[in-house]
């Protein structure tokens, strides 16, 4: 029961986490910037992985996509890749974990198969969560290192004067969504791995010994029964009867839990 609960909870937590990773990847607010905040109008700029937006206090918002790939920093491309890998791994993990759920029966799937699938999905969730956390952390690092030292920098450009104004980029909501979502996916993956241990079928810790009566008269040797149980000195299950009684090792090469003494 506890295993089913752990597996189910792990699945739900991972599902929420992956939904969060998808949401964070699509969000525009990875970095935010206050451009003006005067009595006339307040203008904010926020940038995501795919486009940049300008929003005014009036409610007007204009977004433009990063149409060129070549002009974008390698770090942004790396963050995009990490987030996409995280989503893909998470989605595959979810698909695998659905079939691995103990509460869902599919044909005559054995517990060992379900255990393997649970472990696989758990590992996928862990890697997915780590990808998301890494991606968001790389972006956050970009923001921290991107603050310009100079307050204003004047230079002459094409068609007149150009002035650079220092505007600080701060952490956007998407970063926090990404961190939390990545963490949830990671926790969900760990829970799935824990559940996998409980799902794995226990192996028998005893050796069964079978006795086969023969047509000939069996000569009883004293101490034979004690030795044959496996608890005495005869632990190697050596042959102690002259007749038809044989050890399990000699009769069957693959003992199973369905053999009875």
């Amino acid at each position: 029961m506890a295993v089913t609960a752990c597996q189910g909870l792990g699945f739900v937590v991972s599902l929420i986490g992956i939904a969060g990773i998808i949401a964070a990847t699509c969000m525009d607010q990875w970095s935010t910037q206050d451009l003006y905040n005067n009595p006339v109008t307040a203008v904010f700029n926020y940038q995501g992985l795919w486009r940049s937006c300008v929003r005014e206090s009036s409610g007007f918002t204009e977004c433009r996509g990063y149409f060129t790939l070549l002009g974008l920093p390698a770090m942004l491309q790396a963050v995009r890749a990490l987030m996409i890998v995280g989503i893909v791994l998470g989605a595959i993990g979810l698909l695998v974990s659905i079939f691995a759920l103990k509460c869902i029966r599919i044909g005559s799937m054995e517990d060992s198969a379900k255990a393997n699938m649970t472990l696989t999905s758990g590992i996928m969730f862990i890697v997915s969560g780590l990808c998301a956390i890494a991606g968001v952390s790389v972006f956050a690092n970009m923001l921290v290192t991107n603050f310009w030292m100079s307050t204003a920098n004047m230079y002459t450009g094409m068609g007149g004067m150009v002035q650079t104004v220092q505007t600080r980029y701060t952490f956007g909501a998407a970063l926090f969504v990404g961190w939390v979502a990545g963490g949830l996916t990671l926790i969900g993956g760990v829970m799935m791995c824990i559940a996998c241990r409980g799902l794995a079928p226990e192996e028998t810790n005893y050796k069964a010994v079978s006795y086969h009566a023969s047509g000939h008269s069996v000569a009883y040797k004293p101490g034979g029964f004690k030795a044959s149980t496996g608890f005495g000195s005869n632990t190697k299950n050596k042959k102690i009867y002259d007749g038809g009684a044989r050890t399990e090792d000699e009769v069957q090469s693959y003992p199973s839990k369905h053999d009875y003494v």
């Epitope: 910037q33 203008v43 700029n45 937006c53 300008v54 005014e56």
Partner: nanobody
Framework: QVKLEESGGGLVQAGGSLRLSCAVS????????MGWYRQAPGKQRELVAT???????SYSDSVKGRFTISRDNAKSTVYLQMNSLKPEDTAVYYC???????????????WGQGTRVTVSS
Amino acid sequence: QVKLEESGGGLVQAGGSLRLSCAVSGNFLNIVTMGWYRQAPGKQRELVATTTRGGSTSYSDSVKGRFTISRDNAKSTVYLQMNSLKPEDTAVYYCNADIIPGFLQQLTVHWGQGTRVTVSS
């Protein structure tokens, strides 16, 4: 590289009208605000009018009711319709655009070369 190109300046009689236009070209992410400033001979550059992409406008007291700023977001162009011109409106009119050039780049204030407006009495 971003370029601002003004046009429409010239000589006009007092009480007359002129329409200035300024087009922004080049590679950039977002234009935040666009506006017009002017500099009369021997004076400081002063704000005439500005507009945001959303249509919020502001005017200097000296031109309120006479000048109208408008924009065409699709063409990244700003216009200044000047009516009831006075001799004191004589100046070089500069186009201004606050632009975000690229990803995580700082806001840059771009200025045009200026177009001369002369109002004769």
